[in-house]
């Protein structure tokens, strides 16, 4: 009978050896068989499972001239960069006729210095604020004992006696480095060194100190900054009358915020050149040599109403007997609030001043006392908001109306050039 066809007679004349090494090692397993007739394909098994994508090479050498003579078959399995998943029991398998033959096993083991699965990462933390760092290492061989170091000083008296996978740091007041050592029977591996940068705590209690129509004074309480003094604080403000949802500090505003730096102390800043009667959102962050704190949440604030900055424009006043007709236009100067109405005052040369609230109308007909013979009658008009009256116009003389003539218009205020919308900030 041809060799290898009987179950009790294995064709294998060389079985896989053993490989034990550290991660990354390259090694080769080899098995050899002698068969009569056409050489079979050699398969490799790991832990009883066929390796479909094995990096194997098969060499066949005939021992005679005839195809039916014996052949030596050598199969080599190459393991490149040994990993934990490569470990196990390896065997060669061949099918000869209706029989299956399996070689004696060889073993691949991994044993070396600890290997880090997780290492501490660089991060920033607020001063005196707790945080956690992670470190995880494995063998084989196990066990692996960890020793954490802070600024190269061990945090426990010996490996395995302190925190292992997770280090809880109750807080730092200076930028520090952390690493961990992993110890096993083969030696020591040291992780990367993580730098933990200590930033100032978020400022607290951002609040308004005082409000004026074009100016807000704000103050805040600085957070702890460890051993690093604060160098400055940065205040951001944004117009919030577009209904943005930044009250809770969630999204950043869609437009670029206006930014100002404050020297510290004092932890206070006056914001000038603001729009009156306008909602804003403000926030603050403070900076040390190590970097900036996180921003406070956006604080909604609002400038109060002011009085109109100029008098009504284009006042005309004409007299027809005992009646006087006065009309005007809204002030061109900023109203600094919601216009509530106009006040009008008229006075003759020797008569007391008469004051009237016209409301929001921009014209009025006056019934003059007597026969209308009062001389040198003049009229003044002022706009007002909830904050009070704006400036009065210059007195406008009441001129007799001549039919067919246009009513006189008194341009008593120089018309300012209308500037483009701008933010002259503090």
């Amino acid at each position: 009978a041809p060799r290898g066809t009987q179950a009790e007679e294995s064709p294998f004349v060389g079985n896989p050896g053993n490989i034990t090494g550290a991660r990354g090692l390259t090694g080769t397993l080899r098995c050899q068989l002698q068969v009569q007739g056409e050489p079979p394909e050699v398969h490799w098994l790991r832990d009883g499972q066929i390796l479909e994508l094995a990096d194997s090479t098969q060499t066949q050498v005939p021992l005679g001239e005839d195809e039916q003579d014996d052949w030596i078959v050598v199969s080599q399995l190459r393991i490149t960069s040994l990993q934990l998943s490569d470990t196990g029991q390896y065997q060669c398998l061949v099918f000869l006729g209706h029989q299956t033959f399996v070689s004696q096993p060889g073993y691949v083991g991994l044993e070396g210095l600890p290997y880090f699965l997780e290492e501490p990462e660089d991060r920033t933390v607020a001063a005196n604020t707790p945080f956690n760092l992670s470190c995880q290492a494995q063998g084989p061989p196990e066990p692996v004992d960890l020793l954490w170091l802070q600024d190269a000083v061990p945090l426990a008296t010996a490996p395995g006696h302190g925190p292992q996978r997770s280090l809880h740091v109750p807080g730092l007041n200076k930028t520090s480095s952390f690493s961990c050592e992993a110890h096993n029977a083969k030696g020591v591996t040291t992780s990367r060194t993580a730098t933990i940068t200590v930033l100032p705590q978020q400022p607290r209690n951002l609040h308004l100190v005082s409000r004026q129509p074009t100016e807000l004074e704000v103050a805040w309480t600085p957070g702890l900054s460890g051993i690093y003094p604060l160098t400055h604080c940065t205040l951001q403000a944004v117009l919030s009358d577009d209904g943005m949802g930044i009250q809770a500090g969630e999204p950043d505003p869609p437009e670029e915020p206006l930014t100002s730096q404050a020297s510290v102390p004092p932890h206070q800043l006056r914001l000038g050149s603001l729009h009156p009667h306008t909602p804003y959102h403000i926030r603050v962050a403070c900076t040390s040599s190590q970097g900036p704190s996180s921003w406070t949440h956006w604080l909604p604030v609002e400038t109060p109403e002011g009085v109109p900055l100029g008098p009504p424009e284009n006042i005309s006043a004409t007299r027809n007997g005992s009646q006087a007709f006065v009309h005007w236009q809204e002030p061109r100067a900023p109203l600094q609030g919601t216009l509530l109405g106009y006040r009008l005052a008229y006075q003759g040369q020797d008569t007391p001043e008469v004051l009237m609230d016209i409301g929001l109308r921009q014209e009025v007909t006056l019934e003059l006392q007597g026969d209308g013979s009062v001389s040198n009658l003049t009229v003044c008009v002022a706009a007002y908001t909830a904050a009070g009256d704006g400036p009065w116009s210059l007195p406008v003389p009441l001129e007799a109306w001549r039919p067919g003539e246009a009513q006189p218009v008194h341009q008593l205020v120089k018309e300012p050039s209308t500037p483009a919308f701008s933010w002259p900030w503090w």
Partner: antibody, heavy 113, light 107 residues
Framework: QVQLQESGPGLVKPSETLSLTCTVS????????WGWIRQPPGKGLEWIGY???????SYNPSLKSRVTISRDTSKNQFSLKLSSVTAADTAVYYC???????WGQGTLVTVSS | DIQMTQSPSSLSASVGDRVTITCRAS??????LRWYQQKPGKAPKLMIS???NLAAGVPSRFSGSGSGSDFTLTISSLQPEDFATYYC?????????FGQGTKVEIK
């Protein structure tokens, strides 16, 4: 398999120096920390000190003036020397890895003239 | 030095009993505490590390609790092989110090 084995004289005269060696197999002493613990007959355990993988040492202050722990990495051994011994130093001396997964079996050292 | 006080110094119990041994540190040691079992003529064996972590190969009937200065070793159901002396050890700072031991005997 990790094994630790203490060796040294079982009898030491008073005022002399007690010397013990711990031979470690299956674990490199250039990793982890390695210590000595003793136990007087019928009493509790007392920590003597340790040597680190890098060769630095830490000793029990009550013994510090008399104790030296050293190592020989080429032989994978570390040693204990305790000078000026008295009868109070009679004890079973254990060597161990400081995680205490692995211990020697202990050796009784008697201090007697 | 940190003093470790174990109680009781000895106790008698029967197989199946629940046994509790306490260890008190003279100052806060966090969770830097270990428990050992020692049988006559043998080296101690690590049972619990980090106050609560069961060492490899130790039966689950053993458990550790506590943090700071008060610690407990509990054997939920005493077995014949558990009769031994138990020691606590603090490794928070040098010198490491052991408790004086608790001998668990058969009633």
């Amino acid at each position: 398999q990790v094994q630790l084995q203490e060796s040294g004289p079982g009898l030491v005269k008073p005022s002399e120096t007690l010397s013990l060696t711990c031979t470690v197999s299956g674990y490199s002493i250039t990793s982890n920390y390695w210590g000595w613990i003793r136990q007087p007959p019928g009493k509790g355990l007392e920590w003597i000190g340790y040597i680190t993988y890098s060769g630095s040492t830490s000793y029990n202050p009550s013994l510090k003036s008399r104790v030296t722990i050293s190592r020989d990495t080429s032989k994978n051994q570390f040693s204990l020397k305790l000078s000026s011994v008295t009868a109070a130093d009679t004890a079973v001396y254990y060597c161990a890895i400081t995680t205490f997964y692995y211990w020697g079996q202990g050796t009784l050292v008697t201090v007697s003239s | 030095d940190i003093q470790m006080t174990q109680s009781p110094s000895s106790l008698s119990a029967s197989v199946g009993d629940r046994v509790t041994i306490t260890c008190r540190a003279s100052q806060d040691i966090g969770n830097y505490l270990r428990w050992y079992q020692q049988k006559p003529g043998k080296a101690p064996k690590l049972m619990i590390s980090g106050a609560t972590n069961l060492a490899a190969g130790v039966p689950s009937r053993f458990s550790g609790s506590g943090s700071g200065s008060d610690f407990t070793l509990t054997i939920s159901s005493l077995q014949p092989e558990d009769f031994a002396t138990y020691y606590c050890l603090q490794s928070k700072e040098s010198p490491w110090t052991f408790g004086q031991g608790t001998k668990v005997e058969i009633k």
